[in-house]
């Protein structure tokens, strides 16, 4: 048992033209986090297996906001090590996959959005208990600098953490430079003495007298870097820097083959021989498989149909991207018409319509009065996205549902007496006055002050009742016509209204879920 430790030193734009200025999208600030995946590296099925040695996720780094006109700096990184505990023996050779993820902190409906910025995969040889190994890797336009090591956790010791030692109550029984080791309490062993001069930093040994080199170093004493990538000094746990033997220029200069691929020169070009599970001209297609859980947000991982794609992700509603890492901003397409408010609920889209509109996308232009008929023969008056009821006589309130006393306002002038009637009110005028509201004086010569009034029509005339009856019949006919019109309108819009009410109910339920 033991722990693999990874220290990220820097992540930023690589050298050369076309380097990105910022890891953030135009939506605003973001922060970085890292994911590490370890696989045993020598077994035939290594590329198809999951992160069998373990995986870890870093904390989120500090928020990064791009400064206008400022040079792109190394980006703020999460604090601390990434630690991957392993339970069994340390395999020595392994695949190291490091992913850099971006978390966007702009106004994302439903939370932050993630996207994969860079992924590097390297096959490495590393003995447990050895010094920090340092590396620099390019992934597209990005450059990642990091160190790593594997260390055993007591009682495990050795380059594979397979030997068990435990402290003794009487350690003096072992001579100087010797250590007690299980299974026998009195058994002492010497740690292997490496070949004289073997690099303490880049070499190690499992048997006395040998000198085995860490990845990137060669020579009898592990002093010779195998490529220029080892020449780069890093701000790492070890501050020592090394000299370099820079090979002459050539197609394989710097080893263009990623993921542990070996480079061989061809006339004017190069050819990469990729390890099992890696593909592409430069072995750049990752060997991550479905068992590694590469699909974010619960996405379904399916093995790729062709050799160049290790997997594909079938994303849950509301997510997209090759790893389901991007939250779909479906509202940016402005699907809600007529000024409707768009709500992306993750698994579904909802439009909250303005008054007077309905339908899944607010596409139906409703009459303001539709479905909101005024009761008791009142007429609906439209205006400015609202509605108002003009009530029939005898009724009042917002929807004409309240019975009103038509005589309460004393409508009969000149002392006329008011009588409530189903069609409104009737005024019995005092002597000397006439008219619907007793508003016209009657002159002594029998002619009213109203020139257009028919001669001979007086308050006491028997004809008056007939005229009132005619007026009543006309009013009832008009009211009946309005009611029929309103009912037909209600029927026509009922289905839209019903759909809109259902939509609102669903939206309320889902927003509160």
């Amino acid at each position: 048992a033991g722990v693999f430790e990874l220290q990220i030193h820097s992540f930023g734009p690589g050298p050369g033209p076309g380097a990105p200025r910022s890891p953030c999208s135009a939506r605003g600030p973001c922060r970085l986090f890292f994911r590490v995946c370890l696989k045993p590296g020598l077994s035939e099925e290594a590329a198809e297996s999951p992160c069998a040695l373990g995986a870890a996720l870093s904390a989120r780094g500090p928020v990064y906001t791009e400064q206008p006109e400022a040079p792109a700096p190394d980006l703020p990184l999460p604090n601390g090590l990434l630690q991957v505990p392993f339970r069994d023996a340390w395999p020595g050779t392994f695949s190291l996959i490091i992913e850099t993820w971006r978390e966007e902190l702009g106004d994302q409906i439903g939370g932050p959005a993630w996207s994969l910025l860079a992924r590097v995969t390297r096959r490495r040889r590393l003995a447990a208990g050895g010094p920090w190994a340092r590396d620099i890797q390019r992934a597209g336009a990005w450059e990642l600098r990091f160190s790593y090591r594997a260390r055993c956790e007591l009682p495990a010791v050795g380059t594979a953490c397979t030997r068990l030692c435990r402290p003794r109550s009487a350690p003096s029984r072992c001579g100087p430079g010797l250590r007690p080791c299980a299974p026998l309490e009195d058994e002492c062993e010497a740690p292997p003495v490496c070949r004289a001069g073997c690099s303490l930093e880049h070499g190690f040994c499992e048997q006395p007298g040998e000198c085995r080199c860490l990845e990137g170093w060669t020579g009898p004493l592990c002093m010779v870097p195998v490529s220029t990538s080892s020449c780069l000094g890093l701000r790492g746990p070890s501050s020592t820097t090394t000299g370099c033997l820079v090979p002459g220029p050539g197609p394989c200069d710097g080893n263009p083959c990623a993921n542990g691929g070996s480079c061989s020169e061809t006339p004017g070009s190069f050819e990469c021989t990729c390890p099992r599970g890696f593909y592409g001209l430069r072995c750049e297609v990752s060997g991550v498989t479905c068992a590694d859980g590469p699909c974010f947000n619960g996405g379904l991982c399916v093995g790729g149909a062709d050799p160049d794609s290790a997997y594909i992700c079938h994303c849950p509603p509301g997510f997209q991207g090759s790893n389901c890492e991007k939250r779909v901003d479906r509202c940016s397409l402005q699907p809600c018409r007529n000024g409707g408010l768009c709500l992306d609920l993750g698994h579904a889209l909802r439009c909250r319509c303005r008054a007077g509109f309905a339908g899944p996308r607010c596409e139906h232009d409703l009459d303001d009065c539709a479905g909101r008929a005024c009761a008791n023969g009142g007429t609906c008056v439209e205006g400015g996205g609202a509605h108002r009821c003009s009530c029939a006589l005898g009724f009042g309130g917002r929807n004409c549902r309240e019975r009103a006393d038509p005589c309460a306002a004393r409508p009969c002038a000149h002392g006329g007496r008011c009588y409530a009637h189903f069609s409104g009110l009737v005024c019995a005028c005092a002597p000397g006055y006439m008219g619907a509201r007793c508003e016209f004086p009657v002159h002594p010569d029998g002619v009213s002050a109203l020139p257009a009034a028919p001669p001979g029509l007086r308050p006491g005339d028997p004809q008056r009742a007939g005229v009132i009856a005619v007026i009543v019949v006309v009013v009832i006919a008009i009211v009946a016509g309005i009611v029929v019109l309103v009912i037909s309108r209600k029927k026509r819009m009922a289905k839209y209204e019903k759909a809109e009410i259902k939509e609102m109910g669903e939206m309320h339920r889902e927003l509160n879920a």
């Epitope: 996720l57 068992a291 947000n297 619960g298 379904l300 991982c301 849950p316 509603p317 698994h347």
Partner: antibody
Framework: EVQLVESGGGLVKPGGSLRLSCVAS????????MNWVRQAPGKGLEWVGQ??????????HYAESVKGRFTISREDSKNTVYLQMNSLKTEDTAVYYC????????WGQGTTVTVSS | NIVLTQSPATLSLSPGERATLSCKAS??????VSWFQQKPGQSPRLLIY???NRYTGIPARFSGSGSGTDFTLTISSLEPEDFAVYYC?????????FGGGTKVEIK
């Protein structure tokens, strides 16, 4: 090969408690959403609840029928997800399966929970 | 919650015959429907996702179709090992829900 193995089922009285475990192998467990789905005898499938990842602050979601009584947790270092069931009712009698992801791609063999007096 | 209704409840067929199973959703679920197979004493197994995509390792005789509210699982020529209960599940709206199942039995 991916394997999910549930355990912890058994006979319990109404009002009692039980804790189910599901151990995963063959996958990078810490990267998978985990669900519990149950199946009452002779009946269909019912989703019980879900736990997401460390990067999601281990967010949990539950079916209305178990909300407030059941709790899902996970221990990534042990490749294990748990279902703590309290205040059990006779209608909780079922085979309980653990499954992965949003789409329930991998399933365990199930463990039987019987709630009876 | 979205309700899924499967029909028929039981389908009696002989090996080699074509099986057509139906699943209707109470509201639009797009193509977010999966089909699962469950044999007696076993756990369910994902067959089809996204209404029409075969999951890894599923034989070509299984196919799915439909969108919106009406979905179909077709087994072109029944093999002896295909006699089981089949469930549809919707993944459009949280929480996910399942149909009541269709039992495909030997005639």
């Amino acid at each position: 090969e991916v394997q999910l193995v549930e355990s912890g089922g058994g006979l319990v009285k109404p009002g009692g408690s039980l804790r189910l475990s599901c151990v995963a192998s063959g996958i990078t467990f810490s990267n998978f959403w985990m669900n519990w789905v149950r199946q009452a005898p002779g009946k269909g499938l019912e989703w019980v609840g879900q736990i997401r990842l460390k990067s999601d602050d281990y967010a949990t979601h539950y079916a209305e029928s178990v909300k407030g009584r059941f709790t899902i947790s996970r221990e990534d270092s042990k490749n294990t997800v748990y279902l703590q069931m309290n205040s059990l009712k006779t209608e909780d009698t079922a085979v309980y399966y653990c499954t992965t992801g949003y789409y329930f791609d991998y399933w365990g063999q199930g463990t039987t929970v019987t709630v009876s007096s | 919650n979205i309700v899924l209704t499967q029909s028929p409840a039981t389908l009696s067929l002989s090996p080699g015959e074509r099986a057509t199973l139906s699943c209707k959703a109470s509201e639009n679920v797009g193509t977010y429907v999966s089909w699962f197979q469950q044999k007696p004493g076993q756990s369910p197994r994902l067959l089809i996702y996204g209404a029409s995509n075969r999951y890894t390792g599923i034989p070509a005789r299984f196919s799915g179709s439909g969108s919106g509210t009406d979905f179909t699982l077709t087994i072109s020529s029944l093999e002896p090992e295909d006699f089981a209960v089949y469930y549809c599940g919707q993944f459009y709206s949280f929480p996910s829900t399942f149909g009541g199942g269709t039992k495909v039995e030997i005639k």
